[in-house]
Interface confidence: low
């Protein structure tokens, strides 16, 4: 028997520095976790102790903090090279800055193979990108070889900006011929490494003949065997074993997100490449693991540019941006409108001629808006200003909800109106009218939503049975501020871009902004 140790990360989302336990900015260093310096310490410790080790990343290194905003992927290539990753799969967020924003900083600079079998380039891009990413790579490990085949969510055109010259094929259909090719090359140990979410990971394990192990990402799935070491609740045991359709036991793993854990899986293969045992657990990268001093020094060096960036002007406002709790928790506020408009703008994807856009709606809990921005400072808006408005380091995500769920959410928005509570919703692409004289749970008297399947967008009444796409903070998607109905009833959830980055990009694009209060939220006569 031959033993392989797979170390893996996924959905790191530019958490290069250590973070707090909830993956936001590190405040108390003695209680902080993750970061590439600490990751390197643990990886090196395992490399020294065990003979056959692979370090893999399942995508979405891009997007999530000011590191990505400033360095645009150069930081990913630099520090992944420093950690000597063996391979990476492309995630949807790797396309956030378009194909050029992937090719130049990452694909051309990475010293490790970057993989995806189900992304096919066409047109002029085909020759430009040829060889910069691969469907699979055969890696020598000790005296053996291991095949790594990559895959990426086929929803990427709806979630990011891959352009029109990349075709995202069905993962299973695309993976099978590549795995077959590896088999003909006498590679009998094959890892599928990819970024399509836990459900697809399990399906790949089940349906793609010849795959021995699946290392996934995208769904931020936490798996653990035994008592979990932090706040994350396991979605299943680690590894999660799938019985394939040809009767094999295939381990499937994922390591939560944000570099908080290092996935650690030990696999035993027989001489024909069959998996005969697998075990392990994610390793919590807490402060008991010291940060590697050389990597830490490098981080500090790169950090300097970030501090300068925070105070640079992104754009100007010629109006007061009212982000006060007195406004945003009680009525439509123009800061809420600005943020929602930025959220929709960030999700413009013209993937279908029938639709002007795939999503038109935004909801945002008023309690998530933490500060106004005064226009009397020469109108200047900086990253620092936005960090005061949106201090929680969240993301603006894409969900699919039934109309009935949205109706419940808007009822919840005003169920205890008047107490300055955070659940009051700010909106975009929605016109809502409340009657506060009615009893809680029955206060929404009008709810119109902006059409998507139309050439001239207009507002139509919400249909209870229709499925709508909505952009909202990850906080709401996870049921925060009492929006349990969103968490329980959402039909799909894809994590999006860093909240501050979305708003800063929009302001930079617009240069001068002047959001108004324009009647998105109304109260029927006599009740307010």
């Amino acid at each position: 028997a031959w033993e392989l140790t797979i170390l893996h990360t996924n959905d790191v989302h530019s958490r290069l520095e250590q973070t707090s336990e909830d993956s936001s900015k590190c405040v108390n260093a003695s209680r902080c976790m993750g970061g590439v310096a600490r990751l390197f310490t643990k990886v090196q410790q395992i490399r020294r102790a065990e003979p056959n080790v692979l370090l893999l990343d399942a995508g979405d290194q891009y997007q999530g903090t000011i590191w990505f905003t400033v360095y645009k992927g150069a930081e990913v290539a630099h520090f992944m090279n420093a950690l000597r990753y063996d391979a990476m799969a492309l995630g949807n967020h790797e396309f956030d800055n378009g194909v050029e924003g992937l090719i130049e900083p990452l694909l051309k600079e990475a010293k490790f193979p970057i993989l995806s079998a189900n992304i096919k380039a066409k047109g002029p891009l085909a020759s430009q990108i040829s060889g910069l990413y691969l469907p699979y790579k055969v890696l020598p490990v000790g005296d053996e070889v291991v095949g790594i085949v990559g895959y990426t969510s086929k929803e990427t055109p709806f979630l990011s900006n891959p352009g029109t010259n990349l075709v995202f094929e069905d993962e299973i259909t695309a993976l099978q011929p590549e795995v077959d090719k590896l088999k003909t090359l006498n590679v009998n140990k094959i890892i599928a490494l990819g970024h399509s979410g836990f459900e697809m990971d399990k399906l790949i394990a089940q349906k793609v003949r010849g795959v021995d192990v699946v290392v996934g990402g995208h769904s931020n799935t936490f798996l653990y065997t035994g008592n979990p070491p932090s706040k994350e609740v396991p979605a299943g045991k680690y590894p999660f074993i799938v019985t394939s359709d040809d009767g094999r036991k295939v381990p499937v793993v994922q390591a939560y997100a944000f570099g908080k854990y290092l996935g650690y899986l030990k696999i035993e293969f027989d001489e024909r490449g069959n998996v005969i045992s697998s075990h392990g657990n994610p390793i919590l990268l807490n402060s008991s693991i010291p940060e590697d001093p050389s990597i830490k020094a490098d981080i500090n060096k790169w950090r300097i540019k970030l501090d300068n960036y925070s105070t640079q002007e992104l754009g100007k406002t010629i109006v007061y941006l009212d982000g006060s709790s007195q406004s945003c928790r009680f009525r439509e506020c123009n800061m809420g409108n600005l943020i929602c408009d930025a959220m929709i703008n960030n999700n413009l994807r013209h993937t279908d001629e029938m639709f002007w856009n795939h999503v038109s709606m935004c909801i945002l809990n008023g309690g998530g808006i933490r500060s106004p921005i005064d226009e009397r400072n020469n109108g200047t808006i900086t990253w620092e200003n936005l960090a005061a408005v949106l201090p929680f380091g969240g993301t603006f995500d894409l969900v699919q909800l039934k109309g009935s769920t949205l109706k419940k959410a808007f009822e919840h928005s005003v169920h205890r109106y008047g107490q300055s509570t955070g659940e009051f919703l700010q909106v975009g692409g929605i016109h809502v009218v409340y009657d506060l004289s009615r009893k809680p749970g029955d206060r929404v008297v009008k709810l119109d939503v902006l059409c998507t399947k139309c050439r001239v967008p207009s507002y139509d009444p919400l249909k209870m049975d229709e499925v709508y796409k909505v952009i909202l903070p990850n906080f709401l998607a996870n049921g925060g501020d009492g929006f349990q109905m969103i968490k329980d009833e959402l039909l799909r959830h894809d994590s999006g871009d860093q909240d501050i980055n979305v708003v800063s990009t929009y302001i930079s694009k617009m240069k001068v902004i002047y959001p108004a209060v324009e009647g998105r939220i109304k109260f029927s006569t006599g009740s307010h």
Partner: antibody, heavy 118, light 107 residues
Amino acid sequence: QVQLVQSGAEVKKPGASVKVSCKASGYTFTNYYIYWVRQAPGQRLEWIGWIYPGNLNIKYNEKFKGRVTITADKSASTAYMELSSLRSEDTAVYYCARDDNYAWFAYWGQGTLVTVSS
Amino acid sequence: DIQMTQSPSSLSASVGDRVTITCKASQDVSTAVAWYQQKPGKAPKLLIYWTNTRHTGVPSRFSGSGSGTDHTLTISSLQPEDFATYYCQQHYSTPFTFGQGTKLEIK
């Protein structure tokens, strides 16, 4: 329950085009593939192509490439298969089918007879 | 393209008989074979996929076996409603291909 209801029989002249529809109900249309398969009189079944309405991922059998177009209208939960430059050997019953998590052609429409005759 | 060849092309049997239909692939299709039943004027109905997994609602008298190039559909005890045409299909690689069919008739 899962239902796929296809459009009615068509008679076409050689060189013309035909567009067959397949209306899905009883499940979330965007979550499953729709496949198109045809069966000429007394012949074996022949796979034409597929569409994944969730992201409009489409794949065609090379044999039909250039003549077939598969589309989907998500709002109407309907898939379409258009075959152009019809010839007499295209006379067949055209079926749409849906997959499930494990099987390719798990649920079938009732079929649409397309007759190509001058 | 992978060719799927069924045998026999037709066969006569009686109610209660055990019947075996074979399907030979022109190349290794592993366990990626499905079987369908079709009655005149009707759409095919999925019986078995991945060689031996019965689709929902398919009676246990239908079973599949095989791997590589040789696959078999067995009906352990024929019932009156089983007289139909049966097709094998490979879902190992695109283009998906079907056998020419085996017509099962009442003796």
